[in-house]
Amino acid sequence: GVFNYETETTSVIPAARLFKAFILDGDNLFPKVAPQAISSVENIEGNGGPGTIKKISFPEGLPFKYVKDRVDEVDHTNFKYNYAVIEGGPIGDTLEKISNEIKIVATPDGGSILKISNKYHTKGDHEVKAEQVKASKEMGETLLRAVESYLLAHSDAYNEQKLISEEDLGGEQKLISEEDLHHHHHH
C-alpha cells in the first residue's frame, strides 16, 4: 500500500536561500551543522541531478546505520526537490521505499513555508509504523533548524554573489540583497 504523510513548517529564511543551502548543499552542510544526526553524505553515482544515488550515514547510537537516497527531481525554479529512500534504514521486508517531496514556497514577509510530502510504499498489506513517521519528522526538524541556525549566523553564506560590496561604495549606499527585496513587502 501507499501511505501519504504531509506536513508544513515555516522558516524566516527566504525561499531561494533556504533551497540553496538546505536542498542543493545539504550533502556538505548536514554533517557540519548537525553531526549528531548525520555523520557523512557520499555520492555513489551521478552528479546531483535526477538518478543520483547518495549514501547518508548516521552516527553511532542512532537506530539505523545508513540510508541510500535516489534523487528524482530538482526544480531550481519552483524550489522543489523529489527523492526516494531506496535502501537501508527502515527499508526491508515490510517497506519498499519512501518517496519524498519538498517544496519551498516564498511567503509575503520574505520567509518561506516548506511543504513536505512523504509517501511510504509498503509491501503487501503492511502498515507504516507511527514511530517511523515521527522519527522521520524529527530528523527533518533537526536538519532544517540546524541549517537555519547556520544561515542566521552566517549572513553572507548562500546569498547571491554581489559584484560591488557596500565597502566599495564607501558605505553610503546599501546594495539590495535578496532579503531587502522582501523588506516591508506588505500584502
Partner: antibody, heavy 122, light 108 residues
Framework: QVQLVQSGAEVKKPGASVKVSCKAS????????LHWVRQAPGQGLEWMGL????????YYTQKFQGRVTMTRDTSIDTAYMELNSLRSDDTAIYYC???????????????WGQGTMVTVSS | DIQMTQSPSSLSASVGDRVTITCRAS??????LNWYQQKPGKAPKLLIY???SLQSGVPSRFSGSGSGTDFTLTISSLQPEDFATYYC??????????FGQGTRLEIK
C-alpha cells in the same frame, strides 16, 4: 527564560495613532516569527498579522491593511505594532506572540506577551 | 478566509467530569489546528498543536483529535484550574490565521 514583555497601557483619542512595543528575551529574536493578536473587551481573539524579524517583512490581514505597520529593531530584540486612525472599536488588549516553529504545523503561538490595553475614547 | 466554529459557546461542568469541546472548519485544514486556554486577565496559553500534539508542560488530561474539518479538545478529568475559555485556531498553509469564537467552561 523565554519571554515577551510589552509596553504599558495607552489611552488615545479617535484619529490618533498608537505604537506598542514587544521586547523579546531568552531566545534568538530573528529566528522566530512574531504575531500580533488583539482581543476587544469580552470578545474573542483576532489575528492582525505577522512580522518576520529576520527579513523585516510582514503580512497584515485585509482588515488592518493601510492602518497597521509592524516593524522591529534587531539591535534591541524588540518588535513594534503601530495602528493609525484609531476608532473606538480598536479598544482592545493587543498581544504579541512568538511562533512555535514546529515541523508539524505552521503558525502556532507558543509564547505570549502580557498584553497592552489600548483604550480609544474621546 | 477559513471560518472556525466552536461548540458549545459555553458549558457548565463539575470537577472530575470529562469534557469535550468541538471545533469545525469551513473547509479542510488537514491537521493544522491548535487549541489555547485563556483565563480572565491573562494571555492565552498553547495547549495542543497540530490537532493532537500536547504542548510541553501541559497536563496529559488534555488531548486533541481530528483531521480535515472536525476537531475535538477533551479534558479527561476536570480540575479546578481548568475553568477558563478555550479557543481553536487554524493555520492552514498561509495566512490569514483565524480563531474560533471561544468556549467558556464554567463551574456547575
Amino acid at each position: 527564560q523565554v519571554q515577551l514583555v510589552q509596553s504599558g497601557a495607552e489611552v488615545k483619542k479617535p484619529g490618533a495613532s498608537v505604537k506598542v512595543s514587544c521586547k523579546a528575551s531568552g531566545y534568538t529574536f530573528i529566528a522566530y516569527y512574531l504575531h500580533w493578536v488583539r482581543q476587544a473587551p469580552g470578545q474573542g481573539l483576532e489575528w492582525m498579522g505577522l512580522l518576520n524579524p529576520y527579513t523585516g517583512g510582514s503580512y497584515y490581514t485585509q482588515k488592518f491593511q493601510g492602518r497597521v505597520t509592524m516593524t522591529r529593531d534587531t539591535s534591541i530584540d524588540t518588535a513594534y505594532m503601530e495602528l493609525n486612525s484609531l476608532r473606538s472599536d480598536d479598544t482592545a488588549i493587543y498581544y504579541c506572540a512568538r511562533d512555535k516553529r514546529s515541523y508539524y504545523i505552521p503558525y502556532a503561538f507558543e509564547i505570549w506577551g502580557q498584553g497592552t490595553m489600548v483604550t480609544v475614547s474621546s | 478566509d477559513i471560518q472556525m466554529t466552536q461548540s458549545p459557546s459555553s458549558l457548565s461542568a463539575s470537577v472530575g467530569d470529562r469534557v469535550t469541546i468541538t471545533c469545525r472548519a469551513s473547509q479542510s485544514i488537514s491537521s493544522y489546528l491548535n487549541w489555547y486556554q485563556q483565563k480572565p486577565g491573562k494571555a492565552p496559553k498553547l495547549l495542543i498543536y497540530a490537532a493532537s500534539s500536547l504542548q510541553s508542560g501541559v497536563p496529559s488530561r488534555f488531548s486533541g483529535s481530528g483531521s480535515g474539518t472536525d476537531f475535538t479538545l477533551t479534558i479527561s478529568s476536570l480540575q479546578p484550574e481548568d475553568f477558563a475559555t478555550y479557543y481553536c485556531q487554524q493555520s492552514y498553509s498561509t495566512p490569514p490565521i483565524t480563531f474560533g469564537q471561544g468556549t467558556r467552561l464554567e463551574i456547575k
